[in-house]
Amino acid sequence: ADVCPQKPCLNGGTCAVASNMPDGFICRCPPGFSGARCQSSCGQVKCRRGEQCIHTDSGPRCFCLNPKDCESGCASNPCQHGGTCYPQRQPPHYSCRCPPSFGGSHCELYTAPTSTPPATCQSQYCADKARDGICDEACNSHACQWDGGDCSLTMEDPWANCTSTLRCWEYINNQCDEQCNTAECLFDNFECQRNSKTCKYDKYCADHFKDNHCDQGCNSEECGWDGLDCASDQPENLAEGTLIIVVLLPPEQLLQDSRSFLRALGTLLHTNLRIKQDSQGALMVYPYFGEKSAAMKKQKMTRRSLPEEQEQEQEVIGSKIFLEIDNRQCVQDSDQCFKNTDAAAALLASHAIQGTLSYPLVSVFSELESPRNARRAGSGDYKDDDDKENLYFQ
């Protein structure tokens, strides 16, 4: 039954029938209001001294526009044992970076430095299996470099930049370990999120993700902020760098499924992704021919005698896709946003280790400068076919 005549949307919200929503409708809210029924506004939010209520697309939020003015910021010297305090715009308006041997949100916890020597991969079995392109669980450990990268999208140590005294790869345990809650330590696998929720209308939100139409019921972190459909008026906030992913789906299939793909990866990274465009505005998704043809290409460059038919027989087995991270919503709702693509790539590698990827990713790279050839990708000005191939294998 059409419930819209009952005017379920408050504060001037417009009701639209949506048969696949649990309540049978969805509200489109006017500026200043949010929530499933447009029931939320700044009027109901009491902010602390120095904070200002700003209505965001995710609802009303208290922000500290000038951290020096706010309660419980760094002014109260909250970080113990020589920890460094960093002002934050959201409560509690600071975060502590702790020195070695201390942890906790105020560096109040002493953690005795572990004297255990780093484990070594002693199994001959694992030595034989490493880097064979197959993830073997018996070798999927830090000591064995995650089966030589076979279990971690070719990245042998996703935690290489993590300076915590804890072995953070051992603390993916469904509980918050503050010492691992940094970008370099992959935000403790996002286990420190206070309001870790699942998307209430997941099927609906997946179907309406990134469709250029704002659905307020999907405009939350757990629903991927509706693919930024509700933030089109906000400036982009791009992380530095490019994520380069090889996935075993051909380009046409990947592009057809791109909204689901971007939503799935964005959910893991707790932010939004988009496909990078080249200088001509074309999406940077290219055919991937696999490592075998990379070897064949080497042979071709030395002998230059490969028959054309053989070259054309190369089979496309996947795609190489170039992605950018847009943090415009992440920075409003969280302080766990990736400033560059290095840690984001490492987090995807850690999900591969855990076996929680829903797409057949083969490798992930982070390129902090413009990728070689990317500017020219698809622009039609290649010197010859070899040059074009470089793009696929760089």
């Epitope: 197959i134 073997d136 057949p360």
Partner: antibody, heavy 122, light 107 residues
Framework: EVQLVESGGGLVQPGGSLRLSCAAS????????MSWVRQAPGKGLEWVSY????????YYADSVKGRFTISADTSKNTAYLQMNSLRAEDTAVYYC???????????????WGQGTLVTVSA | DIQMTQSPSSLSASVGDRVTITCRAS??????LAWYQQKPGKAPKLLIY???TRESGVPSRFSGSGSGTDFTLTISSLQPEDFATYYC?????????FGQGTKVEIK
């Protein structure tokens, strides 16, 4: 619908050769590992070999190493088991089975073919 | 190689009975264990993976438990279509090995 269909079984003399095929359909063939598993008459299941079509990497049981070769043709969506130097103890129904985890050999086999009988006898 | 030992090798039960089959690994395989059902002349069918996760479409009367070296498959209320042979399999380390099977027969 995901489907695997084996073919190529038959009667062969000891020392002979046979090539089994497993035609896959309904999924991205190169993304999933494939194993051959055999079952001797009235006996239990024995894992024989594994291949990850994307990388071409292979694993074998000791009992067949050096005699059997697993391969895959991604353009035909087909896996093969080339069996040489066959022995009486290789007599079995041979099943191909898809692994459920993309590049992980450490995953269960969620789709099986109907099997093809190989008989090694003089 | 990792040895998998299943018990019992066969059992007789009636429709409605609760049936338990155990599987023991010769070394720690964490939770990398699957259970398969096989009927005469048919291919095996995956029931449980990850020691306790039911494959989609498998009835809820089938459940798996355990980790490390000791595992159990339980059929809470045996149905006529459940009379078959059941195999456990470790997929932690290659070669992946199966238990010798448990035949569930009608009493």
């Amino acid at each position: 619908e995901v489907q695997l269909v084996e073919s190529g079984g038959g009667l062969v003399q000891p020392g002979g050769s046979l090539r089994l095929s497993c035609a896959a359909s309904g999924y991205t063939f190169s993304s999933y590992g494939m194993s051959w598993v055999r079952q001797a008459p009235g006996k239990g299941l024995e894992w024989v070999s594994y291949i990850y079509p994307y990388s071409g990497a292979t694993y074998y049981a000791d009992s067949v190493k050096g005699r059997f070769t697993i391969s895959a043709d991604t353009s035909k969506n087909t896996a093969y088991l080339q069996m040489n130097s066959l022995r009486a103890e290789d007599t079995a129904v041979y099943y191909c089975a898809r692994h459920s985890g993309y590049y992980r050999i450490s995953s269960a086999m969620d789709v099986w073919g109907q099997g093809t009988l190989v008989t090694v006898s003089a | 190689d990792i040895q998998m030992t299943q018990s019992p090798s066969s059992l007789s039960a009636s429709v409605g009975d609760r049936v338990t089959i155990t599987c023991r690994a010769s070394q720690n395989i964490k939770r990398f264990l699957a259970w398969y059902q096989q009927k005469p002349g048919k291919a095996p069918k995956l029931l449980i993976y990850g020691a306790s996760t039911r494959e989609s479409g498998v009835p809820s009367r089938f459940s798996g438990s355990g980790s490390g070296t000791d595992f159990t498959l339980t059929i809470s209320s045996l149905q006529p279509e459940d009379f078959a042979t059941y195999y456990c399999q470790q997929y932690y380390r290659s070669p992946h090995t199966f238990g010798q099977g448990t035949k569930v027969e009608i009493k």
